[in-house]
Interface confidence: medium
């Protein structure tokens, strides 16, 4: 069986004019998935991205995420690329985004 992922892109504000954009894929099967950030259509280098492992979400399907830090104002240049079971798609950073403020630690 194949269950395509639901993909969601969110932003959170960080210091010094940078924001963290996170791309989450959920409710997909099988487990193999490609999830990576692209800038102007080109995949970012591995060391500029952070990934979560691909883990069960409790419904017989899986979830994972990838995040990267970008300059605020350059959101339109970045897309999250997803490939799963022969299907693929790109997901932009939402332009009318609501920033989730991270609490100071």
């Amino acid at each position: 069986r194949t269950v395509p992922p639901m993909v969601n892109v969110t932003c959170s504000e960080v210091s010094e004019g940078n924001i963290t954009v996170t791309c989450r894929a959920s409710s997909f099967y099988p487990r193999n998935i490609t999830l990576t950030w692209r800038q102007d259509g080109v995949s970012l280098s591995h060391n500029t991205q952070q990934w979560g492992d691909v883990l069960p979400d409790g419904n017989g399907t899986y979830q994972t995420w990838v995040a990267t830090r970008i300059r605020q104002g350059e959101e339109q240049r970045f897309t999250c690329y997803m490939e799963h079971s022969g299907n693929h798609g790109t997901h932009p950073v939402p332009s009318g985004k609501v920033l989730v403020l991270q609490s100071q630690r």
Partner: antibody, heavy 119, light 108 residues
Framework: QVQLQESGPGLVKPSETLSLTCTVS????????VHWIRQPPGKGLEWIGM???????DYNAAFISRVTISVDTSKNQFSLKLSSVTAADTAVYYC?????????????WGQGTLVTVSS | EIVLTQSPGTLSLSPGERATLSCTAS???????LHWYQQKPGQAPRLLIY???NLASGIPDRFSGSGSGTDFTLTISRLEPEDFAVYYC?????????FGQGTKLEIK
């Protein structure tokens, strides 16, 4: 830095169980999974199986009836057990970290340990 | 299972020359899941190129990869003495995750 170290008996008798451990440092076992791969002397690489961070496993069908891969997070160790061994199981056994992200490649390897199956 | 066939089995070249190594899959492999490893005698393999064309950390840019579908290539633009080793392609597209039989790159 990231390190993986395989250990276990270098000699195993036919029909017995091969048991190896992979002790890791420099990364969290709750964040990265591990593959086990073997290489018979003078031959190529063969994937045995892997364990994900939630403890679930994927095995090569060629080994599935006699292989078990597990993790002990308290000891920072992964383990491989291969039962009912024969001379054909003589090989260098490697553990390798399952890289993250969009490729799942084996980004760091142990140095390998040679296991000889002989009576 | 997906069988990866590497050619040639042995490649004899001199330092400074260009090396082209081929990996052919028995069925289509996503470029995201095709990787190359280098192995020197007595050592463990090390990740060279991941996802067909991305250099792993610390790998010099004389190495490059390309391809799609069933045909993939590893190219070393100008051979250095330390490049003589065995090279394996590897697919993570479908279990069991298989390796090619290897190409031995030796000094001519």
């Amino acid at each position: 830095q990231v390190q993986l170290q395989e250990s276990g008996p270098g000699l195993v008798k036919p029909s017995e169980t091969l048991s190896l451990t992979c002790t890791v440092s420099g990364f969290s076992l709750t964040t990265y999974g591990v593959h086990w791969i073997r290489q018979p002397p003078g031959k190529g690489l063969e994937w045995i199986g892997m364990i994900w961070t939630d403890g679930t496993t994927d095995y090569n069908a060629a080994f599935i009836s006699r292989v078990t891969i597990s993790v002990d997070t308290s000891k920072n160790q992964f383990s491989l057990k291969l039962s009912s061994v024969t001379a054909a199981d003589t090989a260098v056994y490697y553990c390798a970290r399952k890289g993250h992200g969009y490729y799942y490649a084996m980004d760091y390897w142990g140095q390998g340990t040679l296991v000889t199956v002989s009576s | 299972e997906i069988v990866l066939t590497q050619s040639p089995g042995t490649l004899s070249l001199s330092p400074g020359e260009r090396a082209t190594l081929s990996c052919t899959a028995s069925s289509s492999v996503s470029s995201s899941y095709l990787h190359w490893y280098q192995q020197k005698p007595g050592q463990a393999p090390r990740l060279l190129i991941y996802s067909t064309s991305n250099l792993a950390s610390g790998i010099p840019d004389r190495f490059s990869g390309s391809g799609s579908g069933t045909d993939f290539t590893l190219t070393i633009s100008r051979l250095e003495p330390e490049d003589f080793a065995v090279y394996y392609c590897h697919q993570y597209h479908r279990s069991p995750f298989t390796f090619g039989q290897g190409t031995k790159l030796e000094i001519k």
